[in-house]
C-alpha cells in the first residue's frame, strides 16, 4: 500500500530544548491507521489516528536522545481482508536542524 507523506510541522524548534513535531499522513482512503515513526531504523513512537483523520503528529521532546536529528521515516498499517495487517511502504526521510531556517 502507498507510502505516507511526512513533514516537519509548526511550531518549529528554535533551540535544542524545543520539541519537534512530525506529521505523517496516509492517503485519503486510509483513515484511522496505526502510524510508526522511525529514526535511523529504530522505532521512536507509535500513534493511532482518530477514525476521522488520515494522519497523526508525533511530538518529540527536545534535549533527548529521540530528538533532534534524523533521518526520520514513518509508516502506517491498516487491517486488510481477513483482518490481516498490511503495512505501507516507508515514507521519504525528513531531517531536523536547529534553528529551522526561515522561509
Amino acid at each position: 500500500i502507498p507510502a505516507p507523506s511526512i513533514r516537519l510541522v509548526p511550531p518549529y524548534p528554535s533551540s535544542q530544548e524545543d520539541p519537534i513535531h512530525i506529521a505523517c499522513m496516509a492517503p485519503g482512503n486510509f483513515p484511522g491507521a496505526n502510524f510508526t515513526l522511525y529514526r535511523g531504523g529504530q522505532v521512536v513512537q507509535l500513534l493511532q489516528a482518530p477514525t476521522d483523520q488520515r494522519g497523526v503528529t508525533f511530538n518529540l521532546s527536545g534535549g533527548s536522545s529521540k530528538a533532534p536529528g534524523g533521518p526520520f521515516h514513518c509508516q502506517y498499517g491498516v487491517l486488510g481482508e481477513l483482518n490481516q495487517s498490511q503495512l505501507s511502504d516507508l515514507s521519504e526521510p525528513v531531517n531536523v536542524s536547529f534553528p529551522v531556517p526561515t522561509w
Epitope: 510541522v9 509548526p10 511550531p11 513512537q45 494522519g55 518529540l60 529551522v100
Partner: antibody, heavy 122, light 107 residues
Amino acid sequence: QVQLQESGPGLVTPSETLSLTCTVSGGSISSVSYYWGWVRQPPGKGLEWIGSIYYSGTTAHNPSLKSRVTMAVDTSKNQFSLSLSSVTAADTAVYFCARGWRYYEDYYFDHWGQGTLVTVSS
Amino acid sequence: AIRMTQSPSSLSASVGDRVTITCQASQDISNYLNWYQQKPGKAPKSLIYAASSLQSGVPSKFSGSGSGTDFTLTISSLQPEDFATYYCQQYYSYPLTFGGGTKVEIK
C-alpha cells in the same frame, strides 16, 4: 462540550512557588489531537504564552521564564499542572489554561478556562 | 523570539463600521497565525486560524488575510458585541508569541 477549570491559591509569597492545576471535563486529555497550554495576562496587559504539554509528557515552555517553569500531566485524573518557582510581583497575573487543537499544520487554542488571578505579595 | 506588532493599539468605531486591524511579524511566518477576541474579564476566544480560516461558529463578518510578515483581521460590519480586544498569535516557531492587542472601543 469540553470545559477547563483552573484551581490553586490566589495569593503566593515572593520567592515561593506558584502551583496551578487545570481539570479537563467533557473530553479526554489523552487525545492525540490536542495539546494543553498555559497563558497568563498581567492586569491591564496582553497575553503571554507560558508553555504547553502533550499527554505523552512532551513539553515546550517560554524561555523568558528561564527554568522556573515545570509542567506535568495526569491522565488518570484528566488534569495538567503548572509550577512557577521563585515568583516575584512581576508574576502577578490572570493565569489561563487552554486546550490546543493540533492537526497537521493547524495549531491553535480552541477552548480556555475562565482564568484565575494569582497575586504575588507578602 | 518572533515579535508580533499590532496596530493600532486602540481604535474607536461606530456600529456598522468596517474595521481593520493589522499584525506584523518580525520575520516570515508563512500563514502560521491565529486571531483571538477577548472581552473584559473573560478568556480569549479563537476567531481565525492559519491566517484566514474561520473558526467553527464564528460569524462570517470576521475575516483574516495575509502571509509572510503582514496580516489583517477585518470586521465587515461592527456590532455591539464586537467591542473587545483582539490579539494575533504566531505559531511558526517556539516560543509562541502574541501581539500586544488592539482594543476596539465604541465611538
